[in-house]
Amino acid sequence: SGVFQLQLQEFINERGVLASGRPCEPGCRTFFRVCLKHFQAVVSPGPCTFGTVSTPVLGTNSFAVRDDSSGGGRNPLQLPFNFTWPGTFSLIIEAWHAPGDDLRPEALPPDALISKIAIQGSLAVGQNWLLDEQTSTLTRLRYSYRVICSDNYYGDNCSRLCKKRNDHFGHYVCQPDGNLSCLPGWTGEYCQQPICLSGCHEQNGYCSKPAECLCRPGWQGRLCNECIPHNGCRHGTCSTPWQCTCDEGWGGLFCDQDLNYCTHHSPCKNGATCSNSGQRSYTCTCRPGYTGVDCELELSECDSNPCRNGGSCKDQEDGYHCLCPPGYYGLHCEHSTLSCADSPCFNGGSCRERNQGANYACECPPNFTGSNCEKKVDRCTSNPCANGGQCLNRGPSRMCRCRPGFTGTYCELHVSDCARNPCAHGGTCHDLENGLMCTCPAGFSGRRCEVRTSIDACASSPCFNRATCYTDLSTDTFVCNCPYGFVGSRCEFPVGLPPSFPW
């Protein structure tokens, strides 16, 4: 659809005569009839297939024609067409004399014709005005013409319909050739697809308007490139949604079981070496001079009573020194210069000679010990505390301070491993000598019944349109991750697609 525009510029009829040679009375009151038709190899009479138009009387004899387009007038003349512009045409322009006011063809005598031109033309759409001049012996007509497309029509022959829009069906303007030019932030054949925030993950993110990034279920972050781990996951990560892959040193379904107490809590003091020995369990190996479960106690080297035979111990920077009583010598006062005659046995100990009296041995009463019965018995020396318990002297008695997980006088009893309810998903816990065992209900397995074996919400393929299914282990449900163009809890609904010609 377009318009053939004809601009009449000047008509010269100096002698004021008709085509027959007869003069007009009083002058030639001139108007024009225009016929536009298909291109003919030889211009021939026939219907004006592309349209006709007539002007009012524009002047007498010779005159210039005013450009009247701005005032809504009739110059240029408009010949609209509703077909593909063929590029060639035949144009006939007749100049007529109007003796009266009635300009209808049937009201005029046939000899009222002043002049007639008929040309074959070639004209592309949107070309600049093409100027032409036709001269005869009596008249001259100067005119120009062009073809423009109607509103919303584009292309070389005005055949492409394009209507700019900014709504659900598209966001575009039209290029001169009729192709769509998407508004900023939109893409696709009809510019219906928003361009999401730069970097927004292609599969895991989407948008309903430009520069947006909305995450599909199971994804988060500004660009929807971070998966959401399993609900309750404490010390774990994911590579796909609802996973809980434990960080190093953590275990369990929710990665909340500490398998590396040493690293996470550094319980051993004074430079001791820490060794993990199970969940929340560890052993400290103390450096010399330290003791205690966590090596928190500084140990005096004299505390072990290294001096024998009543020698007194003195702490030194680099160890200790024994001050021996008379009759003894050696690093620990272990060598005697005494015999039974010297009554060396204290605390009621009996003396027995050895090696023909060159040496002796004391037999000590209960509660005393030492080569001279000089020491009260230390009830802790026999390490009576089991499972790494710490022995403490309390006057005549002793007691054991147990490590976590043990109890009893000598720390010989395990605290029940089952007390913490370690079995997941309703598993039954059994205490064993060195640990525990879980008996799992149907559908679960693993040391702690943490592995789901048979109940899989995704097993029935509930998601449509090639969506990805994820099982939410905490709720026994599934989540569908929809591909582009589908919505709904099962991705069953297509997003409304445009008809092929949305306008």
Epitope: V42, S44, Q120
Partner: antibody, heavy 118, light 107 residues
Framework: EVQLVESGGGVVQPGRSLRLSCAAS????????MYWIRQAPGKGLEWVAF????????YYRDSVKGRFTISRDNSKSTLYLQMNSLRAEDTAVYHC???????????WGQGTMVTVSS | DIQMTQSPSSLSASVGDRVTITCRAS??????LAWYQQKPGKAPKLLIY???RLQDGVPSRFSGSGSGTDFTLTISSLQPEDFATYYC?????????FGQGTKLEIK
């Protein structure tokens, strides 16, 4: 008096060129589309080429396309036909004509003979 | 291309006879057809254009009719000067095409 006078014909060997001219008088040459029409000895009429009044449109019959060129000089009221790579089958009397039946115009020249022979 | 089939190719008639020559186009050419008369050694002369319009100066015994694809030239009463070859020409589309001609001879 309207006149169209062709010139430039003659005998020429195959593959050679000729340029025909048509001088117009007695009418406004620049107003009309012009045609070259030929007639082989003892045969019917055959259209050859066309040029519009302003020279913007040209058409040729398939057998001469790429070999013949029609042109016009409105200031000299003259029509031309440049014929290259001539063939024996181009032998004919060549007429120029101004045809515009809408205006009742039908002017023909008497023709010029072109003979292509080795 | 539009083919123009003219018949008959030759015709013998006498002065005073009514003669009809036909031309058929291979596709619709509306009324864009002309009839020409040609005498030996002369340029063709236009008789009828736009299928039925008589060219100025042509005797009224010549008439044309038809539109679309079928056209007729009629000479109502043959005169001695009418013995010649007659051609139809379609002016609708390029290439312009002529009928093969009808040679009208004296019987």
């Amino acid at each position: 008096e309207v006149q169209l006078v062709e010139s430039g014909g003659g005998v020429v060997q195959p593959g050679r060129s000729l340029r025909l001219s048509c001088a117009a008088s007695g009418f406004t040459f620049s107003n009309y589309g012009m045609y070259w029409i030929r007639q082989a000895p003892g045969k019917g009429l055959e259209w050859v080429a066309f040029i519009s009044h302003g020279g913007g449109i040209t058409y040729y019959r398939d057998s001469v396309k790429g070999r013949f060129t029609i042109s016009r000089d409105n200031s000299k009221s003259t029509l031309y036909l440049q014929m290259n790579s001539l063939r024996a089958e181009d032998t004919a009397v060549y007429h120029c004509a101004a045809l515009n039946w809408e205006l009742g115009i039908d002017y023909w020249g008497q023709g010029t003979m072109v003979t292509v022979s080795s | 291309d539009i083919q123009m089939t003219q018949s008959p190719s030759s015709l013998s008639a006498s002065v005073g006879d009514r003669v009809t020559i036909t031309c058929r186009a291979s596709e619709d050419i509306y009324s864009n057809l002309a009839w020409y008369q040609q005498k030996p050694g002369k340029a063709p002369k236009l008789l009828i254009y736009a299928a039925n319009r008589l060219q100025d100066g042509v005797p009224s015994r010549f008439s044309g009719s038809g539109s679309g694809t079928d056209f007729t030239l009629t000479i109502s009463s043959l005169q001695p000067e009418d013995f010649a070859t007659y051609y139809c020409l379609q002016g609708s589309k390029f290439p312009l095409t002529f009928g093969q001609g009808t040679k009208l001879e004296i019987k």
